[in-house]
């Protein structure tokens, strides 16, 4: 029988009546075009919905948009289009929502061809009121908020000017011309690249990297011969053209670009690319593309300085620059990442790491599943997960994998069970332990979302036909109940729940179609009466993360420590609540060689935990360029993995000596860097 239809499934009592009393329909008085939805703030219940409708006329396109606001998580909406003077809003810029709970919103309007500049509508009270502001430029990008101060905005103009506002878009100042890319750093710093000659495209590889720490009063050139740059965690990366040829290399800075070191990564040619897959304050995952149009590359993981890299995974699927990769951070368990590799026979396989890229392995076959036609051995196969690449290939995969930090251990994904990803219709699988073990959760493709920090999982079947049924589970996907939320089926377009998975409300979006007209409609269902009571201490059980061998003293040790969590019992039907905080207790582990990566000049042979010297460097002094100084390294080959908290046990020796020699490693050394003020 299908999952959730076995006899042992405990029924949630009287759920139909409870849900019927908490189902709210809203029909939008719109012709169907496109709809976009944004949550304003956290736990505010405020949702903005922008509907747009284009009518292509012979000479021009006529557009109409409407703005709606809800302050009860989508149960009721009010048309507030008059607050923005019935102006047509440009959907390609979306709704720029301010960070944290600032309550700020910026909408960018469509203006007629001859106007001097663009127009925005600004709100700083969670979209209760809007102020119209005419801009002295035409925006090329959405307004970007400073993460530290939501009054500070930056935008690029269609003429490549960098514009900054210090008063939430009321007044704008062009702080630099000829700008290609601009990003906020920490402490209200702005990093940007500029071109000197023709254009961004023409000067690629000859761009300059600039920094301003005072919103454009003064500037510092922190790099030349730049191809591109990126920020990840506390690292600033730049790909820099080599002097002699068309190759480029990654340089890294941890002091906002004052000093740079060359990353120990392969250089790439014109057709290749680097990509920061993930970064935190400890380390970075870097993808380096293979030469040629292979569609794959290599993942490297960095040390704590972003300089020394260990090869993490070969043949990593990544189609082209800005293309598709399945790399996914499993946010519900520390150290876990999932991605795809392209095998020699061109099939795609899923790999998982539980230790932040130290080792990769196939996903364990779900116990309740058979190996499919891709499997050579019908008894031995793995689960393969569909992610961005499958979606881009138009496979029947409506959603990427889902995990939430406050729903500990839960991962939901579409997948197939075999030797490789299958093009057949996938099923939905769930893991309750961060990806170690998997169970088939639902037959066929579904949309899914997590509510109440994992207390409820909601799913809707992916179908080309109109739907009127929603499924929900209160036991992490073991048992499912179905609820008919409307008599009249709708063409389903999406599930929406408040980011953070703390809400108990879910909105089902779609449209109705009749002979003459089609309209947007939403149904918001509040599950609060299904989870009648607040969870108590007895509703939680203790779970040790990363546990694979209960008899082993080091069971659960990952990156030098283990963590026990309080997890909701599957049998408990209760509310975690909006204020739920994940309860965990860490304990430190003894160090082993697994807690160290191989240092500069060393590598780990396959299936060996020891680091050995690279043959080509044997007998040579290990000298490399660090922060613009030549360094001499005395090491027995090990460096602690970033973020690893182990203590005692194995303790390899390591010493770095400053050789007091200057080196520029192809890049601006500090004394060559210039500053200027406006």
């Amino acid at each position: 029988s299908a999952p959730g239809e076995d006899e042992e499934c405990g029924r949630v009592r009287d759920f139909v009546a409870k849900l019927a009393n908490n189902t709210h329909q809203h029909v939008f008085d719109d012709l169907r075009g496109s709809v976009s939805l944004s949550w304003v703030g956290d736990s505010t219940g405020v949702i903005l919905v922008l509907t747009t409708f284009h009518v292509p006329l012979v000479i021009m396109t006529f557009g109409q948009s409407k703005l709606y606001r809800s302050e009860d998580y989508g149960k009721n909406f009010k048309d507030i289009t008059d607050l923005i003077n019935n102006t047509f809003i440009r959907t390609e810029f979306g709704m720029a929502i301010g960070p944290e709970n600032s309550g700020k919103v910026v909408l960018t309007a469509e203006v007629s061809g001859g106007s001097r500049g663009g127009r925005i509508f600004r709100s700083s009270d969670f979209a209760k009121n809007f102020v119209q502001t005419d801009l002295p430029f035409h925006p090329l990008t959405q307004m970007m908020y400073s993460p530290q101060n939501s009054d500070y905005l930056l935008a690029l103009s269609t003429e490549n000017g960098l514009w900054v506002s210090k008063n939430f878009g009321g007044k704008w100042e062009e702080i630099h011309k000829a700008v290609c890319l601009a990003k906020w750093g920490s402490d209200n710093t702005i990093f940007f690249t500029t071109y000197a000659n023709g254009s961004c495209k023409a000067d690629l590889g000859a761009l300059e990297l600039w920094r301003t720490s005072d919103l454009g009063k003064s500037f510092k050139t922190i790099g030349v011969k730049i191809y591109s740059f990126g920020l990840g965690g506390r690292f600033l990366f730049a790909s820099v053209m080599a002097d002699k040829d068309t190759t480029r290399r990654i340089h890294v800075s941890t002091d906002q670009g004052d000093t740079w070191s060359m990353a120990q990564l392969p250089s790439v040619g014109q057709e290749q690319f680097y990509s920061i897959l993930a970064a935190n304050d400890d380390m970075v995952f870097m993808h380096v593309d293979e030469p040629g149009d292979t569609g794959f590359g290599t993942i490297f993981t960095s040390d704590d300085r972003g300089i020394v890299y260990s090869k993490s995974l070969d043949r990593h699927l990544y189609t082209t620059t800005g293309g598709e990769t399945d790399f996914t951070n499993v946010t519900s368990l520390r150290g876990v990442y999932i991605t795809s590799v392209l095998s020699e026979d061109n099939s795609i396989q899923t790999m998982i790491t539980f230790d932040q890229g130290g080792r990769w392995t196939h996903l364990r076959k779900p116990e309740n599943s058979e190996c499919d036609a891709t499997a050579k051995n019908k008894n031995e196969c793995s689960l393969h997960i569909h992610a961005s690449y499958s979606i881009s290939q138009k496979l029947n995969v409506p959603m990427a994998p889902l995990s939430e930090p406050n729903a500990v251990g839960i991962v939901i994904a579409h997948g197939s069970v075999g030797d490789a990803i299958s093009v057949m219709v996938p099923d939905v699988y769930i893991s309750d332990d961060g990806g170690y073990s998997w169970t088939k959760m639902l037959e066929g493709p579904h949309y899914y979302t997590i509510l109440d920090s994992g207390g409820i999982i909601v799913a809707i079947e992916h179908s080309s036909r109109p739907i009127n049924v929603i499924k929900f589970s209160t036991d992490e996907g073991q048992c499912w109940q179905t609820y008919t939320f409307t008599r009249d089926p709708i063409y389903f377009t999406g599930l929406a729940s408040e980011p953070g998975a703390r809400s108990m409300n879910i909105s089902i979006w779609g449209f109705t179609e009749s002979f003459l007209t089609s309209q947007w409609v939403s149904y918001t269902i509040d599950f609060k009466d299904i989870l009648e009571r607040n969870c108590e201490e007895k509703d939680y059980t203790i779970w040790l993360a990363h546990s694979t061998d209960p008899e082993d003293y080091e069971d659960g040790c990952i990156l030098g420590y283990k963590e026990q969590f309080l997890r909701l019992r599957k049998s408990s039907v209760c509310q975690n609540g909006r204020d739920y905080v994940v309860t965990k207790q860490p304990s430190i582990c003894l160090c082993s060689l697994e807690d160290f990566l191989c240092d500069f000049g060393y590598y780990r042979p396959e299936n060996d935990s020891k680091c050995v010297e690279q043959p080509e460097l044997k007998g040579h002094d290990l000298e490399f360029c660090l922060y613009g100084r030549e360094e001499h390294l005395t090491t027995n080959g090990y460096r602690k993995i970033p973020g690893d908290k182990c203590q005692g046990g194995v303790n390899p020796v390591r010493e770095v000596k400053d050789l007091k020699k200057k080196c520029t490693s192809n890049f601006l050394s500090p004394e060559k860097q210039n500053s200027k003020s406006n």
Partner: antibody
Framework: QVQLVQSGAEVKKPGASVKVSCKAS????????MHWVRQAPGQGLEWMGW????????SYAQKFQGRVTMTRDTSISTAYMELSRLRSDDTAVYYC?????????????????WGQGTTVTVSS | DIQMTQSPSSLSASVGDRVTITCRAS??????LNWYQQKPGKAPKLLIY???SLQSGVPSRFSGSGSGTDFTLTISSLQPEDFATYYC?????????FGGGTKVEIK
């Protein structure tokens, strides 16, 4: 090998307290729940509660709430169960038992290692 | 609290017999049911955990089945050392509760 060794038999007067110890060896003490179960003469098994040695957190059966205290000393891998305000119907054999673990889950898989039992007699 | 009802409370059987003991929970406990064997003067011994998984070192003549509320312990061919009292126990919801026991005696 994995074993639990309990303290010796006790004879107590009504109203007094008894503290039974359970020394674990052959496994990682911190990694498993310790349950306490009692059995009155000629009767069935009755669960009293558990302690998680690594946190020191406890869960007691309602019946014993307020009378039972479970503690542990991680330095000597020993769990303790103290029952106060003893009554004659507390006369029983008291067992400590290790909670079987399935991967990370600490509960739901029974008790796989038992102590030899401690006989507590409450009599005036 | 979840009540666990075992039946029969006692049975007589001969060596080589197939013996079945049932256990019913007052509400669904998924598959969180365990079976124990206890001999006079000894501590209980875990036989089956999670309804149907055989504890290591336990002979394969013991098997468990069921889920939800109804569970069964089967001894496929009774051996002399199997004469004992058998208890079921649910570990789904606190407090943990045991069945009243089934005493298997020699016919």
């Amino acid at each position: 090998q994995v074993q639990l060794v309990q303290s010796g038999a006790e004879v107590k007067k009504p109203g007094a307290s008894v503290k039974v110890s359970c020394k674990a060896s052959g496994y990682t003490f911190l990694a498993y729940y310790m349950h306490w179960v009692r059995q009155a003469p000629g009767q069935g098994l009755e669960w009293m509660g558990w302690i998680n040695p690594s946190w020191g957190s406890t869960s007691y059966a309602q019946k014993f709430q307020g009378r039972v205290t479970m503690t542990r000393d991680t330095s000597i891998s020993t769990a303790y169960m103290e029952l106060s305000r003893l009554r004659s119907d507390d006369t029983a054999v008291y067992y400590c038992a290790r909670g079987k673990r399935s991967s990370g889950w600490y509960e739901g898989y029974g008790m796989d290692v038992w102590g030899q039992g401690t006989t507590v007699t409450v009599s005036s | 609290d979840i009540q666990m009802t075992q039946s029969p409370s006692s049975l007589s059987a001969s060596v080589g017999d197939r013996v079945t003991i049932t256990c019913r929970a007052s509400q669904s406990i998924s598959s969180y049911l365990n079976w124990y064997q206890q001999k006079p003067g000894k501590a209980p011994k875990l036989l089956i955990y999670a309804a149907s998984s055989l504890q290591s070192g336990v002979p394969s003549r013991f098997s468990g089945s069921g889920s939800g509320t109804d569970f069964t312990l089967t001894i496929s061919s009774l051996q002399p050392e199997d004469f004992a009292t058998y208890y079921c126990q649910q570990s789904d919801v606190s407090p943990i509760t045991f069945g009243g026991g089934t005493k298997v005696e020699i016919k």
